[in-house]
């Protein structure tokens, strides 16, 4: 990606949703009738002019605010505590990596724009899942719809940094 | 593209024993259920039960319970639907399609050309 | 299980004409409804998702409405290319349910 972000980070993307599939606790075919459009803001990781920036922003604040959700009292009652200590584990480890990443990055004179604004958009995503988890009394079923609404999110991000360091390789080359 | 290709027609006997096929691809087969759907010559539609490939979690519908299997094989992208004894009813067009699971998006927005069953002595 | 009604099981239209087709759920489904339109031969389409969300790519004179128990599919202005069997859908709980079908034939 241009910055010495670890050759692992995608690994450690990938082992994210691997933990995120494993702490499934109830069958998904039982919490239909709570599913909610919690409307994750899709252009911001579907678009084809990639700026380095702008794709560190969008997972750093992703890994963010995946770590803030997933570490309250909340979630320690409602997951296995040894899965959730490996989640938030590899967590930590992709933010420094990225917190490295966007030093290097806003150093070299990229747009600030291109980091502040995926970072409120994300905020806003994110606030609609707390209210949610808050108004369905965090159940079973609630923490189930937000698990698997992470995994694609988090999915799509991930494609998001495939698709620029296929881009980076690309002109790399040329 | 999104497809979900099914294979072909088949004419069996009373009592032999069937696995159809339904081969998804152009997106990430691991993060969509697989429905199956039944429809008897000129009646309605009739829901079968569903597979989740990620991990093979089933449900199937009171009605069919106990007389199909859903299966799937997330390595090559395809789910399953087998009789182990067939009656002359199951003639049949079976589809296949895909629902978003508990994420919000279409529900069975893909489906299957479909296969026709033909259970004939 | 929850029933789906749709009514009615059969209608004459001529192009042009708007259509109206009802479904009714025996418990209240909130907006987990979905409309799907079939041709003959073909594997059904999905039209509406959502009670009211229009699946992309489908013409807008297609349109949905209700919540609860009660649902509608609208065709404002009926073309050659409608002709065909509609089926609603319940999809807030397993197993799910369609409704019967309603048959739109040429007048």
């Known amino acids: 990606l241009g910055c010495d972000l670890p050759q692992n980070h995608g690994l450690l993307s990938r082992n994210t949703l691997v933990l995120l599939h494993q702490m499934r606790r109830i069958s998904p075919f039982l919490c239909l009738k709570d599913r909610r459009d919690f409307r994750f803001p899709q252009e911001m990781v579907k678009g084809s002019q990639l700026q380095k920036a702008h794709v560190m922003s969008v997972l750093h604040e992703m890994l963010q605010q995946i770590f803030s959700l997933f570490h309250t009292e909340r979630s320690s009652a409602a997951w296995n505590m040894t899965l959730l200590d490996q989640l938030h584990t590899g967590l930590h480890q992709q933010l420094q990596h990225l917190e490295t990443c966007l030093l290097q990055v806003v150093g070299e004179g990229e747009s600030a724009g291109a980091i502040s604004s995926p970072a409120l958009t994300l905020r806003r995503y994110f606030q609609g899942i707390r209210v949610y988890l808050k108004e369905k009394k965090y159940s079973d079923c609630a923490w189930e719809v937000v698990r698997m609404e992470i995994m694609k999110s988090l999915f799509l991000s991930t494609n998001m940094q495939e698709r620029l360091r296929s881009k980076d390789r690309d002109l790399g080359s040329s | 593209e999104v497809q979900l290709v099914q294979s072909g027609a088949e004419v069996k006997k009373p009592g032999e024993s069937l696995k159809i096929s339904c081969k998804g691809s152009?997106?990430?087969?691991?993060?969509?259920?697989i429905g199956w759907v039944r429809q008897m010559p000129g009646k309605g539609l009739e829901w079968m039960g569903i597979?989740?490939?990620?991990?093979?979690?089933?449900a199937y519908s009171p009605s069919f319970q106990g007389q199909v299997t859903i299966s799937a094989d997330k390595s090559i992208s395809t789910a399953y639907l087998q009789w182990s004894s067939l009656k002359a009813s199951d003639t049949a067009m079976y589809y296949c399609?895909?629902?978003?699971?508990?994420?919000?998006?279409?529900?069975?927005?893909?489906w299957g050309q479909g296969t026709l069953v033909t259970v004939s002595s | 299980d929850i029933q789906m009604t749709q009514s009615p099981s059969s209608l004459s239209a001529s192009v042009g004409d708007r259509v109206t087709i009802t479904c009714r759920a025996s418990?209240?489904?909130?907006?987990?409804l979905n409309w799907y339109q079939q041709k003959p031969g073909k594997a059904p389409k999905l039209l509406i998702y959502?009670?009211?969300s229009l699946q992309s790519g489908v013409p807008s004179r297609f349109s949905g409405s209700g919540s609860g128990t009660d649902f509608t599919l609208t065709i404002s202005s009926l073309q050659p290319e409608d002709f065909a069997t509609y089926y609603c859908?319940?999809?807030?709980?397993?197993?799910?349910?369609f409704g019967q079908g309603t048959k739109v034939e040429i007048k």
């Open positions: 959502a009670a009211s």
């Open positions: 152009g997106y990430s087969f691991t993060s969509y259920w």
């Open positions: 418990q209240s489904i909130n907006r987990f």
């Open positions: 399609a895909r629902h978003p699971g508990l994420n919000w998006a279409p529900d069975f927005d893909y």
């Open positions: 859908q319940q999809a807030i709980d397993l197993p799910f349910t």
């Open positions: 597979i989740d490939p990620s991990d093979s979690d089933t």
